[in-house]
């Protein structure tokens, strides 16, 4: 019998020589070994030349072998996975020539103090790189340029003080980045580029909050659903986002994402997420929705109320800079949750920050009746382009929204997913979309209606129109928005049923009617009639804190007026605060948020 145990896994011969007190490679290894476990032995040094004749070798485990030296002087043409973790390596040789097929490299828990610039040259297939728990103080520029297929990068628990600005350039497939527990003070401007990173870990660093942190702050705000707190032994998919875990070391551990940046330059060069003003508007022809995978659901109820609109039109406006326009493809993750609730980022226990979010839909009165039917509402002829194409273009500085028609769809069986970002485009004519959001349009202060059409659809019989994306008001006249994704639903016992599917059409200026066409499950038989005399203003309002504390519903309204109709990626947004609410700190534009 062999020294090592032999089995087969997925057609590969697996040889397990773990913990056999070996000081060298066993002499009787099978020639067709595909998976070789040599961990927990006392090998000291290792040379790939000793394995060149094992032409099937695909996985090689050399963890906990007391390695102080690795020589790559023999080519292992099929090796895909190399585990060198928990050794005493102080340096790494160049690996590309010897291991051209490598997809996973684990050199975690070693004593690497630095990496040579070309150490990863030739590793064009590398998908996972684990370098956590070493003594890395810096990284060479261009380190990852050869590894364009990288999906997971772990640099946690090192001594990194800074990151090369172009470290992530070209890593279009990167989905997980671990940078926690380093000595990082800031993130270089443009570091993340246009990457959409579903899972990022950034806590336990020495983040220094001054004007240099504004790029990073803005990125955190834009990616709040993708920043997590790492926990030992817990799969990232089983945790909730925790953007508040990223804290200012110099400001009493206040969250970086809420750093006010008082006194910092407000020019686009300092605060822009990236220079997106140069990017032309492009007609969209397809709908793509990106979702975060959060499986622990933190819930909060949303209030739905009807109130008379404010008579005052006096407003204060805050101009906000463009938000991130993603260009990169990303996998779709389905996030399921119970209707009536929404997922919010999990946060630390201290430093509550309050935000208010309101969404107004003003229905101009008409004696329209909502009739429950069992068939899909047929769009008006003028709405037909919705199902074919949607061109989202508008003059840059226009203050009047251009008429647009947009639909955002979600996967068929999703129960109100929470998108992190979305590219608004339209589905093919053959598909019946189930949109969870719609273009927000409001009346100008002059009350002139803007001809805009939006379709709102909620999955399952529901009592609420469900827009799922909105922009939060930000602290202290901050020039950067705090974006969120929000699923708006009503509490179970709401007394005002809202149609499951409704087409809201704001008429041409010459018309004074708003038509509501509804498709309601046969179970819902309530008829909702819009009174002729009084306009109805439906307010969907949310208040939450980083501690998920619920606050009472307030009656004032904040209106969101897009200046360019590119919904979800609003290049510029004005937040209007009605001055009838000056008594409420939540709604006063001078004091929108409680900060720690």
């Amino acid at each position: 019998q062999h020294t090592c145990s032999i089995s087969k896994v997925t057609s590969l011969l697996e040889v397990n020589c773990e913990n056999k007190k070996l000081t060298a490679l066993p002499a009787d290894l099978p020639a067709d070994t595909g998976i070789l476990h040599l961990g927990e032995n006392q090998l000291g040094t290792f040379s790939t030349a000793s394995l060149v004749h094992f032409t099937h070798l695909t996985y090689l485990y050399l963890d906990r072998c007391e390695l102080t030296s690795l020589q790559t002087n023999g080519k292992l043409i099929k090796l895909e996975n190399l585990d060198l973790s928990h050794n005493n390596l102080k340096s790494l040789p160049s690996l590309g020539w010897a291991l051209p097929a490598l997809t996973t490299l684990d050199v975690s828990f070693n004593k690497l103090g630095s990496l040579s610039p070309g150490v990863l040259d030739g590793l064009s297939q590398l998908q996972e790189l684990y370098l956590q728990n070493n003594d890395l103080k810096s990284l060479p520029p261009g380190l990852l340029l050869p590894t364009t297929k990288l999906k997971k990068l772990n640099l946690a628990n090192n001594k990194l003080r800074e990151l090369p600005s172009g470290l992530l350039d070209g890593l279009e497939d990167l989905d997980t980045l671990y940078l926690q527990r380093n000595w990082l003070r800031t993130i270089p401007k443009g570091f993340f580029g246009t990457l959409l990173l579903p899972f990022v870990f950034l806590h336990a660093n020495s983040w220094y909050c001054d004007c240099e942190i504004l790029y990073f702050r803005h990125w955190l705000q834009e990616n709040a659903n993708n920043v997590y707190l790492w926990k030992q032994g817990v799969d990232v998919k089983d945790t909730t986002p925790n953007v508040a875990s990223v804290r200012c070391a110099n400001l009493d551990n206040a969250p970086v994402y809420s750093y006010p940046g008082k006194g910092c330059p407000t020019s686009s060069g300092d605060t822009d997420y990236d220079d997106y003003d140069d990017i032309p508007d492009v007609p969209a022809t397809r709908t793509e929705v990106k979702f975060s995978t959060n499986t622990k659901v933190h819930t909060t109820h949303w209030s739905l109320l009807a109130a008379a609109p404010s008579t005052s039109q006096d407003s204060q406006m805050i101009s906000l800079p463009p938000t991130h326009k993603p260009t990169k493809k990303q996998s779709t993750f389905i996030h399921t949750q119970s209707p009536g609730f929404t997922t919010l980022p999990e946060t630390m226990e201290s430093n509550p920050t309050f935000y208010s979010l309101k969404l107004n839909t003003v229905l101009i009165p008409s004696p329209t009746t909502l009739e429950p039917t069992s068939t899909q509402a047929t769009p008006e002829p003028n709405i037909q382009p919705m199902l074919t194409t949607s061109t989202l273009t508008t003059p840059e500085h226009s203050t009047t929204p251009v008429p647009t028609t947009t639909i955002l769809t979600t996967p068929e069986h999703s129960t109100i997913p929470v998108p992190t970002t979305a590219i608004l485009t339209t589905p093919k004519p053959s598909t019946i979309p189930v949109p969870t959001t719609a273009t927000l349009t409001t009346l100008e202060p002059s009350t002139t209606p803007v001809p805009t059409t939006a379709t709102l659809t909620t999955p399952e019989p529901s009592t609420t129109l469900v827009p799922t994306t909105a922009t939060l008001t930000t602290p202290e006249h901050s020039t950067t928005p705090v974006p969120t994704t929000a699923t708006l639903t009503t509490p179970e016992h709401s007394t005002t049923p809202v149609p499951t599917t409704a087409t809201l059409t704001t008429p041409e200026p010459s018309t004074t009617l708003t038509n509501l066409v509804s498709t309601i499950s046969p179970v819902l038989t309530t008829t909702l009639t819009t009174p002729e005399s009084t306009p109805i203003e439906t307010i969907l309002e949310q208040f939450f804190t980083t501690e998920l504390t619920l606050l009472p519903t307030l009656e004032s309204t904040t209106t969101i007026i897009p200046e360019q109709n590119s919904f979800l990626n609003l290049p510029e947004v004005a937040l209007v605060s009605s001055d009838t609410s000056e008594s409420s700190p939540f709604l006063n534009s001078d004091f929108c948020c409680f900060l720690p």
Partner: antibody, heavy 118, light 113 residues
């Protein structure tokens, strides 16, 4: 046409030994992994051992240390040396050919009966 | 070891019937490297050796009639005979070829009603 013909079965006392053979034809024997699978009377199928084309043997725990699989590529023959036989080893033993490096069995012999009884 | 559980253990059916046999594994048989599920199905008639029908969950062995089909992923698998023929009355076994020791289900005997 692929053919696998087992031989060597018979009655043996507990603790005894037996050597089974499987003569292969109709394919390039040296290029394929080969296996032994058994079936106790009225029962289901149970894998006994395999040997890769390079000659590497592997076994389930139930026979490890008692059974030895081997092959002679020059004779196109597969062997199973069974020692320390037990009553529960009583079964029809099938020789089976694997498909390439995969481990499903695309051809089977007709089987040979091994009875372990005192 | 991976345990394989077949159901039902036996069933009675008539010629022309659609027959479905299920097989569950105690752990996933999906190989993430190639997205293949390592499951095979065999047919065995009394006094005869088993015959390979399907491998990698759904790939029909050469010469096997198209009325035999396999499906499933992860831990749940199905063998379907779309229209039972007289020669199909036999015992059917599933086998995982994901990791050794290779293990079989206990078998499903398809009898004439």
């Amino acid at each position: 046409e692929v053919q696998l013909v087992e031989s060597g079965g018979g009655l043996v006392q507990p603790g005894g030994s037996l050597r089974l053979s499987c003569a292969a034809s109709g394919f390039t024997f040296s290029s394929f992994a080969m296996s032994w699978v058994r079936q106790a009377p009225g029962k289901g199928l149970e894998w006994v051992s395999s040997i890769t084309s390079a000659g590497t043997p592997y076994y389930p725990d139930s026979v490890l240390g008692r059974f030895t699989i081997s092959r002679d590529n020059s004779k196109n023959t597969l062997y199973l040396q069974m020692n320390s036989l037990r009553a529960e080893d009583t079964a029809v033993y099938y020789c089976a050919k694997s498909r390439g490096y995969e481990d499903y069995f695309d051809y089977w012999g007709q089987g040979t009966l091994v009875t372990v009884s005192s | 070891d991976i345990q394989m559980t077949q159901s039902p253990s036996s069933l009675s059916a008539s010629v022309g019937d659609r027959v479905t046999i299920t097989c569950k594994s105690s752990q996933s048989l999906l190989n993430s490297r190639n997205q293949k599920n390592y499951l095979a199905w065999y047919q065995q008639k009394p006094g005869k050796a088993p015959k390979l029908l399907i491998y990698f969950t759904s790939t029909r062995e050469s010469g096997v009639p198209s009325r035999f089909s396999g499906s499933g992923s992860g831990t749940d698998f199905t063998l379907t005979i779309s229209s039972l023929q007289p020669e199909d009355f036999a015992t059917y076994y599933c086998q995982q070829h994901y990791s050794s020791p290779w293990t079989f289900g206990q078998g499903t005997k398809v009898e004439i009603k």
